[in-house]
């Protein structure tokens, strides 16, 4: 087959990729599976550190950080004085808040 991707439909904005006599779908962010029809699991790799609770979210994932940690992946400890290890805390976020 000269055109492995002929008639091949990749859903949800995925792109068909040819190679080695086979074809596969390169899926858009947030999707997976053979035809990109499955919602990808953004929490599969346990991205939330230090006991953070991971939720799939329309924007990808969100971490609910355990008390004492902050950051998009709960990676930054909050110091006892309330300051964080971040150079500057993102505006509008409190220590322990879930982070996008």
């Amino acid at each position: 087959d000269l055109d492995d991707c002929a008639g091949r439909a990749c859903a949800n904005g995925g792109t068909c990729v040819e190679g080695g006599g086979a074809h596969r779908c390169s899926c858009a962010l947030g999707f997976g599976g053979r035809d990109c029809r499955e919602r990808a699991d953004p929490c599969a790799a346990r991205p939330c550190a230090h006991g953070g609770r991971c939720y799939a979210h329309f924007s990808g994932l969100v971490c609910a950080c355990a008390p004492g940690y902050m950051g998009a992946r709960c990676e930054f400890p909050v110091h006892p004085d309330g300051a964080s290890a971040l150079p500057a805390a993102p505006p509008g976020l409190r220590p322990g808040d879930p982070q996008r």
Epitope: R39, D41, C43, A44, C54, Y55, A56, A64, P98
Partner: antibody, heavy 123, light 111 residues
Framework: QEQLVESGGGLVQPEGSLTLTCTAS?????????MCWVRQAPGKGLEWIAC????????TDYANWAKGRFSISKTSSTTVTLQMTSLTVADTATYFC???????????????WGPGTLVTVSS | QVLTQTPSPVSAAVGGTVTISCQAS????????LAWYQQKPGQPPKLLIY???SLASGVPSRFKGSGAGTQFTLTISDLECDDAATYYC????????????FGGGTEVVVK
């Protein structure tokens, strides 16, 4: 339409075991936060038991009193089970399956519930 | 952690107002991770309020949640017969792991 339905309840002898199943329709667990079990003894209040991540990580949380005797697991993208062992009369209750979603920086928001399944522990 | 609800039961006439209190033995997660549920006999609970004061989808504005930390209140105004139910508060905590606790429930009687 999003729905949860529990099954597997019934009469069980003290010290017996039982496995409850929660089946979802209209959505898949992987995109829906956590799936949880809550129980309610006849005429009593609600009691949280456990939650499991809807995704593939399988992360779980248990009430302290449930650790050891209760085990939550995800058997497919639309089914969650609760295995209960060493049951006593005090475990007699309606067992609800509920979906826990993240809303506005808060968690453990149970915005979808099943109708419940009754477990009676009696000799 | 214990969530203590008072009073129970509470009664008021149609069109009246009832206030239910929920006292936590320690602060809930982020000081606002508290929800309120309504339950009628033979039915599962229904989420009314999340984040202490935010109305869940489809819930009328007659229901109002307030409070932070350890002290929370649910107020139901312009009472309707359909509001007769048991109401539960639910707090979320973290202590070497996540967990959740429900209050004992408050029965609302509409006269």
């Amino acid at each position: 339409q999003e729905q949860l339905v529990e099954s597997g309840g019934g009469l069980v002898q003290p010290e017996g075991s039982l496995t409850l199943t929660c089946t979802a329709s209209g959505f898949s667990f992987s995109s829906s936060g956590y799936m949880c079990w809550v129980r309610q003894a006849p005429g009593k209040g609600l009691e949280w038991i456990a939650c499991i991540s809807g995704g593939s990580s399988g992360d779980t949380d248990y009430a302290n009193w449930a650790k050891g005797r209760f085990s939550i697991s995800k058997t497919s993208s639309t089914t969650v089970t609760l295995q209960m062992t060493s049951l006593t009369v005090a475990d007699t209750a309606t067992y609800f399956c509920a979906r826990d979603v993240y809303i506005d920086s808060t968690i453990f928001n149970f915005n979808l519930w099943g109708p419940g399944t009754l477990v009676t522990v009696s000799s | 952690q214990v969530l203590t609800q008072t009073p129970s039961p509470v009664s008021a006439a149609v069109g009246g107002t009832v206030t239910i209190s929920c006292q936590a033995s320690q602060s809930v997660y982020n000081n606002n991770n508290l929800a309120w549920y309504q339950q009628k006999p033979g039915q599962p609970p229904k989420l009314l309020i999340y984040a202490a004061s935010s109305l869940a989808s489809g819930v009328p504005s007659r229901f109002k949640g307030s409070g932070a930390g350890t002290q929370f209140t649910l107020t139901i105004s312009d009472l309707e017969c359909d509001d007769a139910a048991t109401y539960y508060c639910q707090g979320t905590y973290y202590s070497s792991g996540w967990y959740s606790t429900f209050g004992g429930g408050t029965e609302v009687v509409v006269k």
